[in-house]
């Protein structure tokens, strides 16, 4: 039994880090493998993660962590019974994938303006709370070509757009994701999408 693709891990910079790897053949990850992880400092405890299958030869482990700080560094040991398959380390602050934003809402009652709001996925004391920027994806359910991304580079979790920039009388969906430039994070997963019917008053044309 060998590791084909070594574990790669990302942290939500709060409570979970997720490690994925591939074995050289079909593996029952939960019965055959264990991932041990330990914070590097005196008297820290070793924790054991039981991996789950992620495709035939793929495994995934969710490592529970206390509040992450930038200095945290973990040793990782992947075991198959008494055999050490791989040894490595992981610094959560250097491999951050933010949590997805939540509670995306489209407010359509503001005089032909669409107001999209969502919630920051971090509590105020978390470092990422004040460092997230967002991308909002809006698309038409009727027309796959009508697909647009709005970059929200300010901190407020909201976006205003004129309803007239979208077609009237059809349904749209929106979703949002986050990243933090300060930690050079990857993008978060997309939030669940929300749907609305876009309608606005066409301006009266005088001839």
């Amino acid at each position: 039994m060998k590791v084909l693709q070594r574990p790669t891990c990302v942290s939500d910079y709060m409570s979970i880090s997720t490690c994925e790897w591939k074995m050289n053949g079909p593996t029952n990850c939960s019965t055959e493998l264990r991932l041990l992880y330990q914070l590097v400092f005196l008297l820290s405890e070793a924790h054991t993660c039981i991996p789950e299958n992620n495709g035939g030869a793929g495994c995934v482990c969710h490592l529970l962590m206390d509040d992450v700080v930038s200095a945290d560094n973990y040793t990782l040991d992947l075991w198959a019974g008494q055999q050490l398959l791989w040894k490595g380390s992981f610094k959560p602050s250097e491999h951050v994938k933010p949590r997805a934003p939540g509670n995306l809402t489209v407010h359509t009652n503001v005089s032909d303006t669409l107001l999209l709001t969502w919630s920051n996925p971090y509590p105020p004391d978390n470092y990422l709370y004040n460092h997230l920027t967002y991308a909002v994806n809006i698309w038409s359910e009727n027309d796959p070509a009508d697909f647009r991304i709005y970059n929200v580079t300010y901190l407020e979790p909201s976006l205003r757009i004129a309803a007239s920039t979208l077609k009237s009388g059809i349904s749209y969906r929106a979703r949002v994701r986050a990243w933090a430039q300060c930690y050079n994070t990857t993008w978060s997963e997309w939030s669940p999408s929300t749907k609305w019917h876009n309608s606005y008053r066409e301006p009266f044309e005088q001839h």
Epitope: S44, L64, D66, G102, P123
Partner: antibody
Framework: QVQLVESGGGLVQPGGSLRLSCVAS????????MNWVRQAPGKGLEWVSY????????YYADSVKGRFTISRDNAKNSLYLQMNSLRDEDTAVYYC????????WGQGTLVTVSS | DIQMTQSPSAMSASVGDRVTITCRAS??????LAWFQQKPGKVPTRLIY???SLQSGVPSRFSGSGSGTEFTLTISSLQPEDFATYYC?????????FGQGTKVEIK
């Protein structure tokens, strides 16, 4: 091995105060965020409060906000819950529980609020 | 605040039965969900975290699934020591909230 031992419970009248303590051993307390969780007699679990190891930030359940204060003394390996303006509905066994996500619990201390 | 609704609140089952408990969150919590077991007069112990990750030392007959707002705890073959009360917990945001509990009793 990890141990959490709560104390300070007892009988108190409505409107009174009580200070609970939780002494930790078997791990580096200063590196752990901590919680208080309570359970009223015959009822379910209710999270009460949290204090971060990283920032010292604190969070409270709405039911205790403004009345309870969580604190810690890393030099004494101790977690505290100062409970003021106690009400009948605060009667419960109070547990301290360690992060991440309540991996270790103390045995609890009973707080009875009654006249 | 996020509400967690567990069902059923109580159930009777026999040794060997397959038992399923569900937990519904009032809003999306991704996979930030844990399951705890509590026996009478004892302290709760964590069975599952991150919705589906089995806590080390917990028998493999326990499993968790779900994401977003719908979650399930399954005991594949109920054992005598499994008669207890089970709670779900969301830790997606503060305040953290537990479900009201499901008591699994002997039929």
């Amino acid at each position: 091995q990890v141990q959490l031992v709560e104390s300070g419970g007892g009988l108190v009248q409505p409107g009174g105060s009580l200070r609970l303590s939780c002494v930790a051993s078997g791990f580096t307390f200063s590196h752990s965020s901590m919680n208080w969780v309570r359970q009223a007699p015959g009822k379910g679990l209710e999270w009460v409060s949290y204090i971060s190891r990283a920032t010292g930030a604190v969070y409270y359940a709405d039911s205790v906000k403004g009345r309870f204060t969580i604190s810690r003394d890393n030099a004494k390996n101790s977690l505290y819950l100062q409970m003021n303006s106690l009400r009948d509905e605060d009667t419960a066994v109070y547990y301290c529980a360690r992060e991440p996500v309540f991996d270790y619990w103390g045995q609890g201390t009973l707080v009875t609020v009654s006249s | 605040d996020i509400q967690m609704t567990q069902s059923p609140s109580a159930m009777s089952a026999s040794v060997g039965d397959r038992v399923t408990i569900t937990c519904r969150a009032s809003q999306d919590i991704s996979n930030y969900l844990a399951w705890f077991q509590q026996k009478p007069g004892k302290v709760p112990t964590r069975l599952i975290y991150a919705a589906s990750s089995l806590q080390s030392g917990v028998p493999s007959r326990f499993s968790g699934s779900g994401s977003g707002t719908e979650f399930t705890l399954t005991i594949s073959s109920l054992q005598p020591e499994d008669f207890a009360t089970y709670y779900c917990l969301q830790w997606s945001s503060y305040p953290r909230t537990f479900g009201q509990g499901t008591k699994v009793e002997i039929k």
